[in-house]
Structure formats: C-alpha cells, structure tokens
C-alpha cells in the first residue's frame, strides 16, 4: 500500500508506504502534510524506515524537512527534524502512535521522500536469565546473521557480594560509521548495564566489529539489551559469563 | 492528582445490558487509553476492554460481541455496555487509566483505578 | 492470549518476613510486567511497573524484579499494612492479562 496524500491517517493493519506528494518526482512548494500512523492497539510499537533515495532542501533544515515525533501529535516526543540527501535512521516508537510533519517552502525543491511503516516486530523470543555460576550468551542464530528487528533482554543474575566477568569471544553488528551529532550505534547495537536494564548503571553501548572487551559487574545483576534494526544483519556476538564469589554462604539458585 | 468516580445500576436481571459510567477529573484525558476491568466474587481481575479520546475501541476477545466502550470528550467521561447478561457476569466493575504518555515517555500500567461497583445479575 | 501464572496462591507470613511471589508468563514479555496490591473491598493498587520500577509512594520495602517469563514480587520485611492479595499484570501483548492472585495472610 502506497499513498502519496499530503497527510493522512493511518491504522496499520499490513507494513506500507507513505510519501511526500509527487515522490520520486520534485515535491511541491508551500506544501504542510501530516500523518497519524497508528498501531491496533496499545501494546504495538511502530517502526519506520526512510528509503535511501531521500532528497530535501538542505539549508539547516531551515526551509523544507520532515519531522518525526513520537506520540499523537507535535506535543509527542520530539524525534529528529530531517532535511539533505542523507536519509535518516529507523525510528521505533513508545507507544502506538507516530506523527510525521513534511513541510516545504516556496523555492528549492527536492526529490521528497518515502517511508516504510510497520508493527515493530520482537522476532523471535530471545529473551533470557541466567543463574548458573557460567554460561554462555549468543545473539539469536549465532553464528548464522542475525534476525531483524529485535530487541532482546539477556539478565545474568548472581548472588550478591559476587562479581560477574563477561568476556566476548566473537563480536560483529552492523557498523555504525558515520554518526550525527554524537549518537552513536544507531542501527544494531548491545547496551550493557550493571544492574537492570535502564535502572543500573549504564556499562556501554556497542556495535560495530569492536568487541567490548571484558565486562565487569558487582551488583549481583548484569543486563544486556540487543537491538536489531529492520535492515544489514550481521553474525552477532558470543560470550562467556563467570562468576567470582566473594561469599560462598549464598548458594545458586 | 488523577481521580476516576464511577457509577451504573448495581442490579440487573438476565438478558438485560449493563451500563456504567466512569468520569475522570484532573490530568489529561487525551493522553491515555481508558479502560474497564471486572472482578467476579472472590476471582481474579478480567480486562474488558479500553478506549481512545478519538474512539478507537479494543476489546477483549472473550467479551467482544458483548462490550461496547464509548467515549465523550467533552465530560472526559467514558461508559461501558455489556449486553444481555448472565449471572456470570456478576461481578465489580473498576474503571482505570491504562497505557498512554506522560513525562517520561509512553507507560504500560493501570493507574489509578474508580472505586469499583457491584453488579449482580439475578433474576 | 498471554497466561500469567502465580505462586503460591496462599502464602502465610508474619510481621518482619521477607515475602517473595513469583509470577510466570506462558510466552516472553520482555519486562513488562506489573504487580498490584488489593485489599478487600478496594480496588487494586499499582506497587510495580516495567517488572522493576517503584511506583511513586509505594515504600521501597517493595521490589521487583526479572525479565522474559520469570518475575518475582518481594517484600523485604512485612510490615501489618501488607496483609492483602497481589497480582501481576502483562502489558506486553493484547490483551492484557493478569495473574491468578497471591493471597498473603497472617501466620
């Protein structure tokens, strides 16, 4: 499904396309276009992928670009104002809405742009704790590629006063090379905490070939979240976890 | 501070159509879905169903040629209706914010929650 | 649909007890998982959402915690006011279900 509508609403109910009016060909001036995309229902997310062939005015996105925000509406959180020839990265919502701004000015036309909405799928469940005093955690399919569009929560738990060291044996995502305005791993990447995910302190966030070397955690609870984008899979990661313990009253579950 | 006040007939005979009314006061309205739970006597908790301040509906799969949630912005209020009863739907309706946004991004949990009201269904 | 498991159903503590409920999910939902406190002839309370985070004014004696199909509930040291039943809720997929109820009652 295709529309090329100046704004719409849309409730998903199989992945489409929405594009700027007249996209491949010279968008309109003085053209404002919104689209509501909506999830069925409060548990989906929605992801968006901007086709490569991504052309607007590029004059610090004074003139013409495209917005994203992540809610109902401009008050939804605010996720990237775009303009050039770079297109730019996936965008997954929060929630079940995302409100998409094009908005061109009188002069100075480009080719537009296109974009691919879809549920923001999990793939397959990949999801794991860990209790034993050592293990071995591998990204999906290892060391096939990788699937799409995951995110995966791994969760190392030990007793307290017992230190987990988490050494990567074979490291490869999808390279971020040139990254805007500081951030970094933006397609695929493992953010590491010690603790639990967004609650503990935040270890690192990788991807690339570079391996994160050997992790260190003292909490009793080492995290790791992989996320995958919709696109360019690569083999993922294998790694090794052990446990020093500190106090050996406590016993593994 | 977020409070929902529910209120409905408490007594119905089978066949009949249950019909309540959860009113919200404080907050935002637009922001969240808004939904219906039951609890039957001394059982566990049953999402019905939840709605949008535009309208858009989700039901329970379980109920949903039953239940109808509608919705008036205008009051930030929103009703159930769940058709042609039986005595198994003898229970306490609670109305409750469910997922929506706030501060800190899109949230998944039912908070807070109306008071609840005792439907019988009896003949 | 989603089926939440709880254990145990009744568990019998005193005051100062360290609680713990567990709660299982028949397929992964990530983290997210919530846990409610409801007393009789009151509507459910929310403790816990996201699996680990504290709710603003519930006391920090309550902790949650996992990810994926296995979560617990704990209550580090009882305290008279906890005498209730607790729920878990999965808010990872519709429709949202909850868990069959842990009753924890006086030893």
């Known amino acids: 499904f295709r529309n090329d509508k100046c704004g719409d609403t849309i409730k998903i109910e199989s992945p489409g396309y929405l594009t700027s009016p007249g996209y491949p060909h010279s968008y309109h001036p003085s053209e404002k276009c919104e689209w509501l995309i909506q999830a069925p229902d409060p548990y989906q997310r929605i992801m968006i992928n901007f086709n490569p062939h991504f052309d607007l005015e590029d004059r610090d996105c004074k003139y013409d670009y495209v917005e994203v925000f992540d809610g109902e509406n401009e008050n939804g959180h605010f996720r990237g104002k775009f303009c050039g020839k770079i297109a730019p990265p996936p965008v997954v919502s929060s929630g079940p809405f995302l409100f998409i701004k094009f908005v061109s000015d009188y002069e100075t036309h480009g080719a537009g742009f296109s974009i691919r909405y879809e549920i923001f799928k999990r793939g397959p469940e990949c999801s794991q704790n860990y209790t034993t005093p050592s293990g071995v955690i591998k990204s999906p399919g290892f060391p096939e590629k990788y699937p799409n569009s995951l995110e995966c929560t791994y969760i190392v738990f030990v007793p307290k006063m017992s230190e987990i060291i988490l050494e990567f044996e074979s490291f490869d995502l999808e390279p971020d090379s040139n990254p805007p305005g500081g951030m970094f791993c933006r397609y695929d990447r493992l953010e590491i905490w010690d603790g639990f995910p967004d609650v503990g302190p935040h270890i690192g966030r990788y991807c690339g070939q570079k391996t994160p070397g050997r992790i260190r955690s003292s909490s009793g609870i080492l995290s790791m979240v992989f996320y995958t984008d919709s696109a360019i899979a690569k083999e993922g990661f294998s790694a090794n976890y052990s446990v020093l313990q500190s106090s050996v009253s406590e016993d593994f579950k | 501070q977020v409070q929902l006040q529910q209120w409905g007939a408490g007594l119905l005979k089978p066949s009949e159509t249950l019909s309540l009314t959860c009113a919200v006061y404080g907050g935002s309205f637009v922001k969240y879905y808004w939904s219906w739970i039951r609890q039957p006597p001394g059982k566990g908790l049953e999402w019905i169903g939840d709605i949008w301040h535009s309208g858009m509906t989700n039901y329970n799969p379980s109920l949903k040629s039953r239940v109808t949630i509608s919705v008036d912005t205008s009051k930030n209020q929103f009703s159930l209706k769940l058709s042609s009863v039986t005595a198994a739907d003898t229970a306490v309706y609670y109305c409750?914010?469910?997922?929506?946004?706030?501060?800190?991004?899109?949230?998944?949990?039912?908070?807070?929650w109306g008071q609840g009201t005792l439907v019988t269904v009896s003949s | 649909d989603i089926q939440m498991t709880q254990s145990p159903s009744t568990l019998s503590a005193s005051v100062g007890d360290r609680v713990t409920i567990t709660c299982r999910a028949s397929?992964?939902?990530?983290?997210?998982l919530a846990w409610y406190q409801q007393k009789p002839g009151k509507a459910p309370k929310l403790l816990i959402y996201?699996?680990?985070s504290l709710e603003s004014g519930v006391p920090s004696r309550f902790s949650g915690s996992g990810s994926g199909t296995e979560f617990t509930l704990t209550i580090s040291s009882l305290q008279p006011d906890d005498f209730a039943t607790y729920y878990c809720?999965?808010?990872?997929?519709?429709?949202?279900?909850f868990g069959g109820g842990t009753k924890v009652e006086i030893k």
């Open positions: 996201k699996a680990s």
């Open positions: 397929q992964s939902i990530s983290s997210w």
């Open positions: 809720q999965q808010l990872n997929s519709y429709p949202p279900t």
């Open positions: 409750a914010r469910g997922p929506g946004y706030d501060s800190s991004g899109y949230s998944r949990r039912f908070d807070p």
